[in-house]
Interface confidence: low
């Protein structure tokens, strides 16, 4: 046997090259036949009325033919025949790859609530062979469940991803990525998650700056509440007591002028949105006013006083009002 061919894999719509090669040629006639065993080329003559076949090279040692605009119906075995004695025959198999026609991602709902499990589906239509679908949430790969539907040698793959969403997922892309031999580079589609989440509440002491609260001083606390949707309600309350009469509430700010010991206690900022409620507590302790030492008459003494400030904030970042997660910073 001195007639050789190579199998060809081609993407639909592109060009396939079929080559019949002869070792130790004796100038025998070479013929190329299609899967229906119709003659495409007999030597350098094309009897077949399909102008997509064009002669690239003809010699005693090679018949090389191109087939343009390949379609799936062109797939199959092509026969090279060498009219030696006895005749020799070899075949090449053309495999046609069809990239997915369309890549669709479908998300169960436009807006999800943190903790909710949502379904995301991605469909790669009409490919050959079947497409492999990979899921990513941002840069993290996730596991989906795929179903393959076959119709007329073509495959439609649908991958289902069940995704439990968290607040950190808001604005993160969910990416459906296709892997297919007919696709070079990344073929992907993505949707951005929109996640609603309960408020996160933080209290910041904006005055006094050094954090030590003494009798007669003023106190200013600012409540920062971040959530989605942005909290509509941010309120200050005093836990287990009335708010001091001299306290002034202005939006997220709490002002208490002329602090005294009766102001000691826990001040709570509460925030809520449609997802849930959260609060943060500030424990106020009012220290004695600084004592002034009269200067001695004969000697000068420098006294250095070191003060330790204790700032305690108790935060509850859970939805609902019962219980608390206590984080104490010294």
């Amino acid at each position: 046997q001195n007639l050789f061919t190579k199998d060809v894999t081609v993407i639909e719509g592109e060009v396939a090259t079929i080559s019949c090669q002869v070792n130790k040629s004796d100038d025998s006639v070479i013929q190329l036949l299609n899967p229906n065993r119709q003659t495409i080329y007999f030597r350098d003559f094309r009897p077949l009325k399909d102008s997509r076949f064009q002669l690239l090279n003809f010699s005693s040692s090679e018949l090389k033919v191109s087939l343009t605009n390949v379609s799936i119906s062109d797939e199959g075995r092509y026969f090279c025949q060498l009219y030696t004695d006895p005749p020799q025959e070899s075949y090449t198999t053309i495999t046609v790859l069809v990239p997915p026609r369309n890549l669709m991602i479908d998300i169960q709902k436009d807006t999800a609530v943190e903790g909710e499990e949502i379904e995301v589906n991605c469909t790669a239509m009409a490919s050959k062979p079947a497409t492999t679908i990979r899921w990513f949430k941002g840069n993290t790969e996730l596991k989906g469940k795929s179903e393959v539907e076959e119709w007329s040698d073509m495959y439609t793959v649908t991958s289902q991803l069940m995704l439990k969403v968290h607040k950190e997922d808001d604005g993160v892309p969910v990416i459906c990525q296709v892997e297919h031999p007919a696709v070079t580079g990344n073929l992907q589609t993505q949707r951005y998650l929109e996640v609603q989440y309960k408020p996160q509440v933080h209290i910041q002491m904006t005055y006094p700056l050094q954090g030590l609260t003494r009798e007669g001083d003023a106190l200013e606390l600012t409540c920062e509440a971040i959530g989605k949707p942005q909290p509509v309600m941010v309120t200050w309350v005093r836990v287990d007591d009335e708010m001091p009469q001299h306290a002034v509430l202005s939006g997220p700010n709490l002002f208490i002028n002329n602090l005294n010991k009766t102001d000691n206690g826990t001040y709570r900022c509460e925030a809520s949105n449609i997802v849930g409620k959260a609060h943060s507590d500030y424990m106020l302790y009012v220290y004695d006013p600084p004592t002034t030492i009269p200067p001695p008459t004969t000697t000068t003494t420098t006294t250095t006083t070191t003060t330790t400030t204790i700032l305690t904030i108790i935060t509850d970042s859970r939805a609902g009002e019962e219980g608390s997660i206590r984080a104490v910073d010294h």
């Epitope: 808001d170 892309p173 589609t189």
Partner: antibody, heavy 115, light 107 residues
Amino acid sequence: QVQLQQWGAGLLKPSETLSLTCAVYGGSFGGYYWGWIRQPPGKGLEWIGEINHSGSTNYNPSLKSRVTISVDTPKNQFSLKLSSVTAADTAVYYCARGGWYPDPWGQGTLVTVSS
Amino acid sequence: SSELTQDPAVSVALGQTVRITCQGDSLRSYYASWYQQKPGQAPVLVIYGKNNRPSGIPDRFSGSSSGNTASLTITGAQAEDEADYYCNSRDSSGNVVFGGGTKLTVL
């Protein structure tokens, strides 16, 4: 409330490189794509490309050979460079938070290419 | 050439209803987003997703979709609605695409 502020040279000569920067204020920078869109005078909007905080980019195929979008995550900034500009690149350039739909947008910078 | 097609201009009488359409293959799979742009200003998102309005957008703006066509409807058009409107989506490669824009005149 996310706000985008952009700046860069407004007048260029042909063959020079357009350079714009956009700063993001008041919102999360990670987890989003950040993009550039342009609008020639009296014409429609054309997407240029986008980048995420980790530097992964997508470009408009028609501009890909001339475009570089980069990111400075610590500064919450991203930048556009468009090389070998011609008069056809004269446009208002907008930065925007990317996604399925770009929103919000920067104020826009008119870049004029003229010899 | 844009992969999303819009009528260049549409007019509406004050207080009447107007529909602006956008066509494209990608819209068989995806919803369109819609932007309003007034002279000298950046575009403003008015509709996204199935029919979602960002805060501050009047409820006279609504969106719908059928087949490869997306529509923006303004019910009871006001003088301040006179602007250019752009639709937007992504193509099968994940690239952002915009329609050519529709100039709305309120008579």
